[in-house]
C-alpha cells in the first residue's frame, strides 16, 4: 500500500521564515526610528548619548559579505536580548518624562521579544548553534536624574535603530545563501 | 504534502551495525535542520542526534556519541543515521525529524538482540 | 530521568479543561529556549501541536494552547474530547548538547 500519507504542512519553510523575519525586524526598524524621532522632538539631544552597558555595534556595511549564518543569527539574539534587558529598565526606571513615549515604548518591547522568538525559532529549524544568552549582567541601576532618563533613551533608541538596520542588511544577505 | 519515510531498521546482534535512512519529499529538504529521535518500547521520546540544514553542524546524544553518524545528502534529500557498536539498550523506534522538529516520519525498528 | 519533567499522568472527563506542566532549568526553559508540544496518539509518530512557547500550527485546534513562565511550561486542553487521549511530550532546546531535551511524557486519559 506504500507509506501512509504525510502530515500537511504546519509551518513555513526556513527560508519564508526568514523572509518573515526580515519584515518584522524592518517593521521594528521603522517603530524605533518613529519613536528616536518622537524622543528628539520632545526632548532635544545635545550630541551623541552612550550607554556602556549596551552593546557595541556588531558589525560594518563593509564587513556584511564575510558574514556566517550561525555567527549573524547568534550576534543579532545577543544584541537584542540586551536591547529588551534595556527598554525594559527605561519602562520601569525611566521616570515620569518619558511616561509621553507610552505606549509605544510597551508596543516596542512586544515587538522585540516577538523578533528574538522568532531568529530562535529560525535557528532551531535550521539546527544552528544556539549557544546560551550571556549570563544577565548586573542590574542596571537607575538614572540619576530625570535628564540621566532622557539620554539613556536616546542612547537606547540610536543604539537599537543602528542594530537593527544593520541585522536587515545581514538577514537579507543570508537570505541569498540559505 | 511532507513526507519522511525511514528504512535500514531490524534485528542486529550485540556489536553489530546498521544504517538507516530517511527519505524526504513535499518540502524544503535543504532548507531544514534534521534530526534523529529514537523511542524505546513503551518509554518516551529521546533526542538522538541533529545536522544543520547544510550539514556543518552535527550533534549527539551522550549515549550514542562516537558510535552513532549523522549525515545528509541534499542533492538526493535522504537523511542517515550510521549506527556501530550497537547495545540491547539502543533497541527503539528511531524517527527522522525535521525543523524544530515540525515533521516526523513513521519511524523504523531497530531491535539489538542475540 | 528526563532534563524536563512531565507528570507521569493526566486524567480528565469530556468537556473539561485539563492542563499538563513541564519544569525544566535555568539551563534550557529559563534560559530564555522555547518550548514545544508533541502530542503521540497510540501506535503513531508524534506530532507538533505547539512551538514556540504559544504558537500553533496550522490544523491543530484552538482547543490547545500552551504558555511559559520562568522554568516551567504549560499545556492547556479545553473541551477535552475521547480523541486526545494520548502522550504528551515538551521538548526545548538544551545549549549544552545543542539539541533539543524531551520531557518524560504525560499519558492523558479521558474518562
Known amino acids: 500500500p506504500g507509506p501512509p500519507p504525510g502530515p500537511p504542512r504546519v509551518s513555513p519553510d526556513p527560508r519564508a521564515e526568514l523572509d518573515s523575519t526580515v519584515l518584522l525586524t524592518r517593521s521594528l526598524l521603522a517603530d524605533t526610528r518613529q519613536l528616536a524621532a518622537q524622543l528628539r522632538d520632545k526632548f532635544p539631544a545635545d550630541g551623541d548619548h552612550n550607554l556602556d552597558s549596551l552593546p557595541t555595534l556588531a558589525m560594518s556595511a563593509g564587513a556584511l559579505g564575510a558574514l556566517q549564518l550561525p555567527g549573524v543569527l547568534t550576534r543579532l539574539r545577543a544584541d537584542l536580548l540586551s536591547y529588551l534587558r534595556h527598554v525594559q529598565w527605561l519602562r520601569r526606571a525611566g521616570g515620569s518624562s518619558l511616561k509621553t513615549l507610552e505606549p509605544e515604548l510597551g508596543t516596542l518591547q512586544a515587538r522585540l521579544d516577538r523578533l528574538l522568538r522568532r531568529l530562535q525559532l529560525l535557528m532551531s529549524r535550521l539546527a544552528l548553534p544556539q549557544p546560551p544568552p550571556d549570563p544577565p549582567a548586573p542590574p542596571l541601576a537607575p538614572p540619576s536624574s530625570a535628564w540621566g532618563g532622557i539620554r539613556a533613551a536616546h542612547a537606547i533608541l540610536g543604539g537599537l535603530h543602528l542594530t537593527l538596520d544593520w541585522a536587515v542588511r545581514g538577514l537579507l544577505l543570508l537570505k541569498t545563501r540559505l | 504534502e511532507v513526507q519522511l519515510l525511514e528504512s535500514g531498521g531490524g534485528l542486529v546482534q550485540p556489536g553489530g551495525s546498521l544504517r538507516l535512512s530517511c527519505a524526504a519529499s513535499?518540502?524544503?529538504?535543504?532548507?531544514?535542520?534534521m534530526h534523529w529521535v529514537r523511542q524505546a518500547p513503551g518509554k518516551g521520546l529521546e533526542w538522538v542526534s541533529v545536522?544543520?540544514?547544510?550539514?556543518?553542524?552535527?550533534y549527539y546524544a551522550d549515549s550514542v556519541k562516537g558510535r552513532f553518524t549523522i549525515s545528509r545528502d541534499n542533492s538526493k534529500n535522504t537523511l542517515y543515521l550510521q549506527m556501530n557498536s550497537l547495545r540491547a539498550e539502543d533497541t527503539a523506534v528511531y524517527y527522522c525529524?525535521?525543523?524544530?522538529?515540525?515533521?516526523w516520519g513513521q519511524g523504523t525498528l531497530v531491535t539489538v538482540s542475540s | 530521568q528526563s532534563v524536563l519533567t512531565q507528570p507521569p499522568s493526566a486524567s480528565g472527563t469530556p468537556g473539561q479543561r485539563v492542563t499538563i506542566s513541564c519544569t525544566g532549568s535555568?539551563?534550557?526553559?529559563?534560559?530564555?529556549?522555547?518550548v514545544h508540544w508533541y502530542q503521540q496518539l497510540p501506535g503513531t509518530a508524534p506530532k507538533l501541536l505547539i512551538y514556540?512557547?504559544?504558537e500553533r500550527p496550522s490544523g491543530v485546534p484552538d482547543r490547545f494552547s500552551g504558555s511559559k513562565s520562568g522554568t516551567s511550561a504549560s499545556l492547556a486542553i479545553s473541551g477535552l474530547r475521547s480523541e486526545d487521549e494520548a502522550d504528551y511530550y515538551c521538548?526545548?532546546?538544551?545549549?549544552?548538547?545543542?539539541?533539543?531535551?524531551f520531557g518524560g511524557g504525560t499519558k492523558l486519559t479521558v474518562l
Open positions: 513535499g518540502f524544503t529538504f535543504s532548507s531544514y535542520g
Open positions: 514556540s512557547n504559544n
Open positions: 545536522i544543520s540544514y547544510d550539514g556543518s553542524y552535527k
Open positions: 521538548a526545548a532546546w538544551d545549549p549544552s548538547l545543542n539539541g533539543p531535551v
Open positions: 535555568s539551563s534550557n526553559i529559563g534560559a530564555g529556549y522555547d
Open positions: 525529524a525535521a525543523g524544530v522538529p515540525d515533521y
